[in-house]
């Protein structure tokens, strides 16, 4: 999301609203561990990582704690005491907001309701996903709360069906992330399944000799 | 729809201070999500940001500047304000307010004042 | 600060043709640039955002692409009252800067 001409790439995830994830592929450092220094507010003094993520031995990210009246992260990356990048951030752009907790149906004729615990913050969507083995693609319905109802079911076909929260766009710009789907859930005639049968795929036409 | 009117603007010493005012009509300055802006425009045309106040009265403001200004606002008049200080020949613009898009501070601008020209000089 | 570069600084295009302008961003941004439009003696009007959404009221021969680093406004058809200065705007990074404008001018 956010990279430099400088033989760095950086990537900005901020989960939930609670910890900001930095990361670098520092192609032109291979074999050096470079430091990350943050600070939330430009009259403080930066302050040094001290949640490091390695790969291969070698320092490529950082994990920061942040909180809800932090916006604005002022970070630089630097090799020995040199800054290779330095830049300002509103953090906000880069939220990924936590997967669906608490998930529960409820099932009534053909419809089902799909409900979790709301997020602590607003902005956001509530998308579930559902499919029939008869259907090749998920399809998508979401609301601006956890309480999602999807209509027309056939009861008699099973359905699988996860959940993920998504940042609006309106409030957070279209560079966010969603969050990681629930597990898929299988429904049948109201009861829970383990699985229902893979989704079928159109037969491939036989070619003529 | 929202209207901007900046006022204010004039002749100032080097040195001296200036407090311009911006009167928003149509639109609440409180309605939660949106942030207010003052941008600045020199004469060669550059734009600056300077800094935000939002619907819950919290401030950005541009490092270059922070020292020398101050955005508040007075909800029963709909009315924002810039206070700034120590006035130099560079600081010649002519000053906007402006409104953020839906989605607070770190976007676009879709509003805008006609400007109001400060020129500094003795 | 991110350092918007907007290029060229004025172009000359006839009416009726296509204006393609540059705008070039230090860092990357995403897809968090805005355009704007400034005819004499007026305050700047947003015309896009968000690198190539569209604004409510701004005809459709305005156009954005890009993302990262690159952005591109498109003139499909250039219009009498098209002819203005055009500036970029970056909102991921703090300040928020803008580009120094490309002047478009009738050939």
């Known amino acids: 999301q956010v990279a430099t001409g400088e033989g760095l790439q950086i990537q900005i995830m901020y989960f939930n609203l609670e910890t900001v994830q930095v990361t670098w592929n520092a192609s032109h450092y291979p074999r050096s561990n470079l430091s990350f220094h943050y600070k939330f507010s430009r009259d403080e003094a930066y302050d040094q990582c001290t949640v490091y993520i390695l790969q291969e031995g070698h320092t490529s990210g950082c994990l920061l704690d942040a909180e809800q009246q932090d916006d604005i992260l002022y970070f630089s990356i630097r090799n020995g005491t040199h800054p290779v990048f330095t830049a300002s951030r509103w953090i906000f752009y880069y939220l990924k907001p936590s997967s669906p907790k608490q998930v529960s149906f409820s099932w009534h004729q053909d419809a089902v309701t799909l409900t979790c615990s709301d997020l602590s913050y607003r902005g956001l969507l509530y998308e579930v996903q559902y499919r029939s083995p008869f259907d090749t693609e998920w399809q998508s319905k979401q609301e601006n709360t956890c309480n999602v109802t999807v209509e027309d079911l056939d009861a008699e076909k099973c359905y699988a069906f996860r959940a993920r929260v998504k940042a609006m766009e309106d409030a957070y710009g279209p560079d966010t992330y969603p969050s990681d789907w629930s597990e898929v859930t299988c429904w049948q005639r109201g009861e829970t399944r383990d699985s229902c049968p893979e989704p079928r795929t159109p037969p491939k036409p036989k070619l003529s000799k | 729809q929202v209207q901007l009117v900046e006022s204010g603007g004039g002749l100032v010493k080097p040195g001296g201070s200036l407090r311009l005012s911006c009167a928003a009509s149509?639109?609440?300055?409180?309605?939660?999500?949106?942030?207010w802006t003052w941008i600045r425009q020199f004469p060669g045309k550059g734009l600056e940001w300077m800094g935000y106040i939002g619907y819950n009265s919290k401030t950005y403001y541009n490092p270059a500047l922070k020292s020398r200004i101050t955005i508040s606002r007075d909800n029963a008049k709909n009315s924002l304000y810039l206070q700034m200080n120590s006035l130099r020949a560079e600081d010649t613009a002519v000053y906007y307010c402006a409104r953020s898009l839906y989605g607070g501070y770190k976007d676009a601008f879709d509003s805008w004042g006609q400007g109001t020209l400060v020129t500094v000089s003795s | 600060e991110i350092v918007m570069t907007q290029s060229p600084a004025t172009l000359s295009v006839s009416p009726g043709e296509r204006a393609t302008l540059s705008c070039r961003a230090s860092?990357?941004?995403?897809?968090?640039l805005h355009w704007y439009q400034q005819k004499p003696g007026q305050a700047p009007r947003l015309l896009i955002k968000f690198a190539s959404r569209s604004i409510t009221g701004i005809p459709a021969r305005f156009s954005g692409s890009g993302s990262g680093t690159e952005f591109t406004l498109t003139i499909s058809s250039l219009q009498s009252e098209d002819f203005a200065v055009y500036y970029c705007?970056?909102?991921?990074?703090?300040?928020?800067?803008f580009g120094q404008g490309t002047k478009l001018e009738i050939k």
């Open positions: 705007q970056q909102s991921p990074g703090f300040p928020p800067t």
């Open positions: 860092q990357s941004i995403g897809t968090s």
């Open positions: 149509g639109f609440s300055i409180t309605t939660s999500g949106y942030y």
